[in-house]
């Protein structure tokens, strides 16, 4: 899916009202410099295309996140603020109800949910410099 | 754990051509812009080039402006450095490092490679 | 072409605070960075966009950037801290990458 031509603005005040104290909380207990970056993003499409990614596909070491209710609002304000979006990832959805399995917080499920949240960040950021 | 690990260095005759590789591993190669640093001995740093993390477009310092072409492999997470028609002066260590970028913006390089030394020597 | 230019060496005395700074053109403008290089090793990243410090390094280290000046601050200066310290701009309009000629840092 190409992100372009999301409202990006309507999905930063979703961020910052709901999914970012989500992501918050399931980080709990966990401190904020515990994981290094891996991963980053260019702009405001490819940031959410790594948001994405991170948040719906499952990773060695970590099945699903697709569950966790910052997932669930996540995958919300998608449907809503870009447009076509949902229509994409209903064979995800389904695909991904066949898999789903018993919830277990892992390590390397805080690790990839340290990188969502730099991701938001980064989405989310204030100009750069005119450099 | 974040690593980048140079290769290719060695000793070659000026005129003549060498190719160096990074190998990036603990993070998501893809998403981060790269850049080749160089160090000639007793001397501070100088950039070299960068490529954007797409690897759809490249910058070059005007030194090697030219002669050096950067490339990347997303798939294989490989950077590249072709250096063609080799001068003593680029006689140095040569590091790889990653830069987040922002739009056409690329920001601090926080991961280095250790380097490997290019000697251009008759 | 733009040009960082950094004193070639400056001396602390342990405990003391060293400042070491990065001169240019309307430097105020541009995220400045600054790196740490010890003999034989790699650079290593000691404070991004003027100001901000990547989790590993101590809050000894700190950065500001005004004006024509941009000043790397280390507070309480340790042996360890003796090496090399660069400068870092990225000039977007030119594209290109510019580091100042380093500063070699002593604790007497």
């Known amino acids: 899916y190409d992100f372009t031509n999301c409202d990006f603005e309507k999905i930063k005040a979703a961020y910052l009202s709901t999914i970012s104290k989500d992501l918050i909380t399931y980080m709990s207990g966990t401190k904020s410099t515990e994981f290094n970056n891996t991963v980053s993003c260019s702009n405001r499409p490819h940031c959410l295309t790594e948001i994405q990614s991170l948040t719906f596909n499952p990773t060695a070491g970590c099945a699903s996140l697709a569950k966790e209710m910052f997932a669930m609002k996540t995958k919300a304000a998608l449907a809503i603020w870009c447009p076509g979006y949902s229509e994409t990832q209903i064979n995800a959805t389904q695909a991904m109800k066949k898999r789903r399995k018993r919830k277990v917080t892992t390590n390397k499920c805080l690790e990839q949910v340290s990188q969502l949240q730099g991701l938001w960040r980064r989405f989310n950021r204030p100009l750069l410099k005119q450099q | 754990q974040m690593q980048l690990v140079e290769s290719g260095g060695g000793v070659v005759q000026p005129g003549r051509s060498l190719r160096l590789s990074c190998a990036a591993s603990?993070?998501?190669?893809?998403?981060?812009?790269m850049h080749w640093v160089r160090q000639a001995p007793g001397k501070g740093l100088e950039w070299v080039a960068v490529?954007?993390?797409?690897?759809?477009?490249?910058h070059y310092a005007d030194s090697v402006k030219g002669r050096f072409t950067i490339t990347r492999d997303n798939s294989k997470n490989t950077l590249n450095l072709q250096m063609n028609s080799l001068r003593a002066e680029d006689t140095a260590v040569y590091y790889c490092?990653?830069?987040?970028?922002?739009?056409?913006?690329?920001?601090?390089?926080?991961?280095w490679g250790q380097g490997t030394m290019v000697t251009v020597s008759s | 072409s733009y040009v960082l230019t950094q004193p070639p060496s400056v001396s602390v005395a342990p405990g003391q605070t060293a400042r070491i700074t990065c001169g240019g053109n309307?430097?105020?403008?541009?995220?400045v960075h600054w790196y740490q290089q010890k003999p034989g090793q790699a650079p290593v990243l000691v404070v991004y966009?003027?100001?901000d410090r990547p989790s590993w390094i101590p809050e000894r280290f700190s950065g500001s950037n005004s004006g024509n000046t941009a000043t790397l601050t280390i507070s309480r200066g340790e042996a360890g801290d003796e090496a090399d310290y660069y400068c870092?701009?990225?000039?977007?309009?030119?594209?290109?990458?510019?580091f100042g000629g380093g500063t070699k840092l002593t604790v007497l």
């Open positions: 490092a990653r830069s987040p970028q922002w739009e056409d913006i690329f920001e601090s390089m926080d991961v």
């Open positions: 603990g993070f998501t190669f893809r998403t981060y812009g």
């Open positions: 490529i954007w993390y797409s690897g759809s477009d490249t």
């Open positions: 309307y430097i105020g403008s541009f995220s």
């Open positions: 966009d003027d100001s």
């Open positions: 870092q701009i990225y000039v977007s309009a030119s594209r290109l990458v510019v």
